[in-house]
């Protein structure tokens, strides 16, 4: 797996280098979990024909992926920093179940798909100390989780397979769509 | 990296229009994020509009809004800036750029390929 922003060679060898922003890290951290996304996908498309599905058809689903609606705040028509941001937090917390989910589905991408669970915990933080209006974040309920891990996990094979090419596709669209907002603020 | 080309640009009276595309032979286009710069002689490169991955999420910067509408075909791997009312400072150098990360934004920092430019000019 690759190592985490700032720990990489280039980092270490330019110690002169300014300490990045709170945006700066923010941005690097998504990126790195953008680069994560794309090796775990390379792998599932590598393995199934699930990538040649149409959006449309793959829009067709009973998953309940976080997604960015207008009244959200993320986009243009209507921004709203607070409203935008705490819409983030509250889908990345929502996205950990779906995280943990892929866990277990790689078989030469195991560390990768730690890497970019582990990474998009450290996202949280960082998010979170930039939210001003944190009571307004709702975490999910522990018990309905572990009840939907164990009903995803007991799919057959082939919903595995395209239960995890969802997640990966929607957690990208996520994370680009919040990353977009984010470069805003 | 991908390489980028810009075309459509041309002398256009005021009031008039033009639509500059941005064309790859590129794979894997549709999982760029693309923006549209300008340089108006003597000035820094400013951003004008980028599309995400997903083409619902556009930006436009405050001079341009409500004028000029960013839109992308995949299927034909490029995208359209349609420029409607343009005035005499719409005149400048209009250069596309794409992100591998599918994110964009109005910096040219977030971009890691670019086009040689086209030349739009508004003169009566």
């Known amino acids: 797996a690759p190592v985490p922003p700032g720990e990489d060679s280039k980092d270490v060898a330019a110690p002169h280098r300014q300490p990045l922003t709170s945006s700066e890290r923010i941005d690097k951290q998504i990126r790195y979990i953008l680069d994560g996304i794309s090796a775990l996908r390379k792998e599932t498309c590598n393995k199934s024909n699930m990538c040649e599905s149409s959006k449309e058809a793959l829009a067709e689903n009973n998953l309940n992926l976080p997604k960015m609606a207008e009244k959200d705040g993320c986009f243009q028509s209507g921004f709203n920093e607070e409203t935008c941001l705490v819409k983030i937090i509250t889908g990345l917390l929502e996205f950990e179940v779906y995280l943990e989910y892929l866990q277990n589905r790689f078989e030469s991408s195991e560390e990768q798909a730690r890497a970019v669970q582990m990474s998009t915990k450290v996202l949280i933080q960082f998010l979170q100390k930039k939210a001003k209006n944190l009571d307004a974040i709702t975490t999910p309920d522990p018990t309905t989780n572990a009840s939907l891990l164990t009903k995803l996990q007991a799919q057959n094979q082939w919903l595995q397979d395209m239960t995890t090419h969802l997640i990966l596709r929607s957690f990208k669209e996520f994370l680009q769509s919040s990353l977009r907002a984010l470069r805003q603020m | 990296e991908v390489q980028l080309v810009e075309s459509g640009g041309g002398l256009v009276q005021p009031g008039g229009s033009l639509q500059l595309s941005c064309t790859t032979s590129?794979?894997?286009?549709?999982?760029?994020?693309v923006g549209w710069f300008r340089q108006a002689p003597g000035k820094e490169r400013e951003f004008v509009a980028d599309i995400g991955e997903n083409a619902d999420n556009t930006w436009y910067a405050h001079s341009v809004k409500g004028r000029f509408t960013i839109s992308r075909d995949d299927a034909k791997n490029t995208v359209y800036l349609e420029m409607d009312g343009l005035k005499p400072e719409d005149t400048a150098v209009y250069y596309c750029?794409?992100?591998?990360?599918?994110?964009?934004?109005?910096?040219?920092?977030?971009?890691?390929?670019w086009g040689q430019g086209t030349q739009v000019t508004v003169s009566s």
């Open positions: 750029a794409a992100d591998k990360y599918g994110v964009g934004g109005n910096a040219q920092g977030y971009y890691d390929s």
């Open positions: 590129g794979r894997h286009f549709d999982e760029y994020a």
